[in-house]
């Protein structure tokens, strides 16, 4: 950055190099150039010369004042006009930053995605700070009282191998940056209660010719959790409102769920599961599309990872892949 240049003087910021966004700040420049009594001192922000709010304090020093500074980052440098020098002489430079102290982290959540071998902890960091903000995740065993700390800049994956203090833990998050520090409430967890089953996937759909045609959705999960509760939501693509069906399953077999749908309409389906009676759900699966036939012939549809349609007479259903905001359930 600009802070690496060789200086012939000194530049400093009041109240500080990192300050709260919207503050009034002063940038001072003091020249110390051999055989130069500066005729004029100039300030540059991001390479552009500033023309206003500059005050000469004494022979070697000037001040640039900003009201309500709102830029997250800026590179400042100052120069001097020296007699007998054709070009301006660089005095010094500094990178400055503005932002906010961290909010109190809330909604601390820790889950173990099945087959990941990790406990993943996330939280709501609150408003954007604009400046480098670090988070320390504290994990304290309720059985051994031993505490471990993990430094991160966002979420954290903690290997279950490092959780040697039994199954009950307290987890909390400290947020800190140059402008402040905050700490979340403590979350109490039991490792057996936070496992999210391996992602449920809709694989294909079939509309069967009957007096009332019915659509069968085939879906599955690699989970080895014995008691799993799932929700499947579906709607016509033209609708805003989802219909939701609930299921209890152990995924011994591929699941087959029946729906009585309107003919000649494109529907979208998603599924998600949780270990029965536990708190955390998988994210919704990728979108799966199925168009019901106009009349009675049997239609089999398959899932495709990309948005490609089958040609020919069969109606294609597609799974468009990662359209959900969070597909971490897709492990294993």
């Amino acid at each position: 950055g600009i802070t690496n240049i060789n200086c012939s003087g000194h530049i400093w910021v009041e109240p500080a190099t990192i300050f709260k966004m919207g503050m009034n700040i002063s940038i001072y420049c003091q020249a110390a150039i051999k055989n130069c009594q500066p005729r004029k001192l100039h300030f540059y922000k991001n390479g552009i010369k500033e023309r206003f709010q500059i005050t000469r304090i004494n022979k070697t020093t000037a001040r640039l004042w900003y009201k309500n500074f709102l830029e997250p980052h800026a590179s400042m440098y100052c120069t001097a006009e020296c007699p007998k020098h054709f070009q301006e002489t660089l005095i010094c430079g500094k990178d400055i930053s503005s932002g906010y102290p961290p909010d109190i982290p809330d909604e601390v959540t820790c889950v173990i995605y099945e087959y990941s071998g990790n406990m993943t902890c996330t939280w709501n960091a609150g408003k954007l700070t604009y400046i480098d903000t670090k988070y320390v995740v504290h994990v304290k065993s309720l059985e051994t009282e031993e505490e471990q700390q993990y430094l991160t800049s966002s979420y954290i994956n903690i290997s279950t191998d490092s959780l040697q203090g039994g199954k009950k833990y307290l987890v909390w998050v400290q947020a800190a940056n140059a402008l402040g520090m905050e700490e979340s409430k403590q979350l109490q967890i039991h490792l057996d209660d936070i496992v999210i089953p391996s992602a449920a996937v809709i694989s294909r759909a079939e509309t069967i010719n009957a007096t009332v045609p019915k659509t069968i959705i085939y879906w599955d999960s690699q989970t080895t959790i014995e008691k799993v509760s799932c929700e499947m939501r579906y709607k016509a693509t033209t609708n805003q409102t989802w219909n939701v069906k609930e299921f209890d399953t152990n995924f011994t077999y591929v699941q087959q769920s029946e729906f009585y749908l309107e003919p000649n309409i494109k529907y979208v389906f998603q599924v998600r599961c949780q270990e029965t009676g536990k708190r955390y759900w998988q994210p919704w699966s990728s979108l799966f599309f199925h168009k019901t036939p106009e009349t009675v012939p049997q239609v089999t549809s398959k899932a495709f990872q990309h948005d490609t349609w089958n040609s020919g007479l069969t109606v294609a259903s597609i799974s468009t892949g990662h359209l959900t905001s969070d597909n971490r359930g897709d492990i294993g």
Epitope: Y115, S203, R204, Q222
Partner: antibody, heavy 117, light 107 residues
Framework: QIQLVQSGPELVKPGASVKMSCKTS????????INWVKQRPGQGLEWIGW????????NYNEKFKGKATLTVDTSSRTAYMQLNSLTSEDSAVYFC??????????WGQGTTLTVSS | DIQMTQSSSSFSVSLGDRVTITCKAS??????LAWYQQKPGNAPRLLIS???SLGTGVLSRFSGSGSGKDYTLSITSLQTEDVATYYC?????????FGAGTKLELK
């Protein structure tokens, strides 16, 4: 009944590529994950990765990323594994195995790969 | 990756013996463990999943036990057809990993 029939033995030169197959029958092809497992002579088993034909999804052991490529042809119910930039370390028996869970219920008979100049 | 250690690479056994094969994981597997039997020139065969659940068609003289990091495969009365190599496999964490195998050899 469920059957997995793998292609025959391969003798290839170092640096070359090979594509072996695993033809399946006796079950709904899209219902099972197809895994590939490596066994070097007199040694243990190493999981290479799986492919899920229902959505053409793959998951590789990090160690085999760039070495193995898994594909399927749903119409012929066949899974393929291509191995590239072969060295003597790749000489092994390669098994395909199907599963709905992360353990392997049904296995092919294995394909012997010999890499030699 | 999780390391799976089968402490004995081979075992000398007699017909009718009760045989115990052990497998130790580098971390807690929460019972996500399978056992396989492999005979020379053949593919492995699933014996047990979930540390204790017998696979389809597996005879009741085979049983699995254990929890945490330590698991055991037991054969109550060894028969000729049980002479083979036995592998454990973890599925707590991808990549799935196997033990190096324990070979049973007749005395």
């Amino acid at each position: 009944q469920i059957q997995l029939v793998q292609s025959g033995p391969e003798l290839v030169k170092p640096g070359a590529s090979v594509k072996m197959s695993c033809k399946t029958s006796g079950y709904t092809f899209t219902d099972y994950y197809i895994n590939w497992v490596k066994q070097r002579p007199g040694q243990g088993l190493e999981w290479i990765g799986w492919i899920y034909p229902a959505i053409n999804n793959t998951n590789y052991n990090e160690k085999f990323k760039g070495k193995a490529t898994l594909t399927v042809d749903t119409s012929s119910r066949t899974a393929y594994m291509q191995l590239n930039s072969l060295t003597s370390e790749d000489s092994a028996v390669y098994f395909c195995a199907i599963s709905r869970k992360p353990y392997f219920d049904y296995w092919g008979q294995g394909t012997t790969l010999t890499v030699s100049s | 990756d999780i390391q799976m250690t089968q402490s004995s690479s081979s075992f000398s056994v007699s017909l009718g013996d009760r045989v115990t094969i052990t497998c130790k994981a580098s971390e807690d597997l929460y019972n996500r463990l399978a056992w396989y039997q492999q005979k020379p020139g053949n593919a492995p065969r699933l014996l047990i999943s979930g540390a204790t659940s017998l696979g389809t068609g597996v005879l009741s003289r085979f049983s699995g036990s254990g929890s945490g990091k330590d698991y055991t495969l037991s054969i109550t009365s060894l028969q000729t057809e049980d002479v083979a190599t036995y592998y454990c496999q973890q599925y707590w964490s991808i990549p799935w990993t196997f033990g190096a195998g324990t070979k049973l050899e007749l005395k």
